[in-house]
């Protein structure tokens, strides 16, 4: 069998055996290593020799095999974008940011850049749940049945009404969407103006 | 300006090694530029020995590859050449030189130096 | 290892006259990967030319370079009393880096 071409070698179709670790280089019609994550390219290559790969300095980085001739600046979350940081800057990877809580991303270009306050759920609803925390605005879902939530609010959750024999009372009023169930002692009637309390 | 010389030794016994250090003044060994060993028998045409870079990363002469070693001291801004097991078919002069950017000819060369082979 | 033949050995003309060197490759190499060498008694060489036609800092213009797939040429438009002297040309198309055996240009 042919022995394994190592870089430089000549490439007349302008492709290169190793994709993610090589690339074709058109000035010199040949394939060359690219660098490693954490590095850049210190010396280009040549049909003599390879690419000569260098780390990357502090606060940059290069985060896939690549042929750059320099290392990208290290960035920090930007508080008054919204965002805060989740993992450090390395050699290898970027700052790792995040909306912070109560706010989503509203603008994405293959990052989020710009996060915004979530929007609020009227009472009688909740947000719907997200995979991803901080990706979208909320989208706000009829509390189901037996619960209610009773505030504007962009994260409160619907609870479930308050079952009043568990606590030895009798149901002076039933919960709805927006309110819970109104207990009293079954032994007292319970006044008009007191609805909405619980009478012990 | 840039100059680069060579020093060593001018007389090496057979099967012994042949050391050389080239000494670089006015540039940094350090900016990417490769460097070469470059050797002219008496009376005879050039042969290329070999490259290296401040990485430490070399290229050699497949001829020479078995008998050579260069490596390169940053803090001193030199680097060196090693060729063991001499004869008499190495002397030669012997010429460092700087490796011309991207491209792989040679733009400043040392003067030389001489090294004879012999008991 | 790509060979560089380069003739005439020895090339015999007065001041003032046109020199052409030749240096053949044993294979095609790009026009691209061809440099040519002055060098004078007890000295090392210089570098002339780069990329077969593309003179080095400080080379007069009386020295020009051509050539493509095996044959390459040095032109010495009008030559110097200092421009008797010996060139090599080199090729880096494919390691290892090999030089033609040298043309000497000397006074008629």
């Known amino acids: 069998s042919q022995p394994q071409a190592v870089p430089p070698y000549a490439s007349e179709n302008q492709t290169c055996r190793d994709q993610e670790k090589e690339y074709y280089e058109p000035q010199h019609r040949i394939c060359c290593s690219r660098c490693p994550p954490g590095t850049y390219v210190s010396a280009k290559c040549s049909r003599i020799r390879d690419t000569v790969c260098a780390t990357c300095a502090e606060n940059s980085y290069n985060e896939h095999w690549n042929y750059l001739t320099i290392c990208q600046l290290c960035r920090p979350c930007d508080p008054v974008m919204g965002l805060e940081e989740i993992a450090p800057c390395t050699s290898k990877r970027k700052t790792q940011c995040r909306c912070q809580p109560g706010m989503f991303c509203a603008a994405w270009a293959l990052e989020c850049t710009h996060c915004e306050l979530l929007s609020d759920c009227p009472p009688g609803t909740e947000a719907e749940l997200k995979d991803e925390v901080g990706k979208g605005n909320n989208h706000c879902v009829p509390c189901k049945a037996g619960h209610f939530q009773n505030t504007s609010s962009p994260s409160a959750r619907c609870q479930p009404h308050t079952r009043c024999e568990n606590q030895g009372l009798v149901e002076a009023a039933p919960g709805t969407a927006q309110s819970d169930t109104t207990c009293k002692n079954p032994l007292e009637p319970l006044p008009p103006e007191m609805s909405g309390t619980m009478l012990m | 300006q840039v100059q680069v010389q060579e020093s060593g030794p001018g007389l090496v016994k057979p099967s012994d090694t042949l050391s050389l250090t080239c000494a670089v003044s006015?540039?940094?060994?350090?900016?990417?530029?490769?460097w070469g060993w470059i050797r002219q028998p008496p009376g005879k045409g050039l042969e290329w020995i070999g490259y290296?870079?401040?990485?430490?990363?070399?290229y050699y002469n497949p001829s020479l590859k078995s008998r050579v070693t260069m490596s390169v001291d940053t803090s001193k801004n030199q680097f060196s050449l090693k060729l063991n097991s001499v004869t008499a078919v190495d002397t030669a002069v012997y010429y460092c030189?700087?490796?011309?950017?991207?491209?792989?000819?040679?733009?400043?060369w040392g003067q030389g130096t001489m090294v004879t082979v012999s008991s | 290892e790509i060979v560089l033949t380069q003739s005439p050995g020895t090339l015999s003309l007065s001041p003032g006259e046109r020199a052409t060197l030749s240096c053949r490759a044993s294979?095609?190499?790009?026009?691209?990967?061809l440099a040519w060498y002055q060098q004078k008694p007890g000295q090392a060489p210089r570098l002339l030319i780069y990329?077969?036609?593309s003179r080095a800092t400080g080379i007069p213009d009386r020295f020009s370079g051509s050539g493509s797939g095996t044959d390459f040429t040095l032109n010495i438009s009008r030559l110097e009393p200092e421009d008797f002297v010996v060139y090599y040309c080199?090729?880096?198309?494919?390691?290892?880096?090999?030089f033609g055996g040298g043309t000497k240009v000397e006074i008629k």
């Open positions: 006015g540039y940094s060994i350090s900016n990417s530029i490769w």
């Open positions: 080199q090729q880096y198309y494919l390691s290892p880096l090999t």
């Open positions: 290296i870079h401040y990485s430490g990363n070399t």
């Open positions: 990329g077969a036609s």
């Open positions: 294979q095609s190499i790009s026009s691209s990967y």
């Open positions: 030189a700087r490796n011309f950017g991207d491209v792989d000819a040679f733009d400043i």
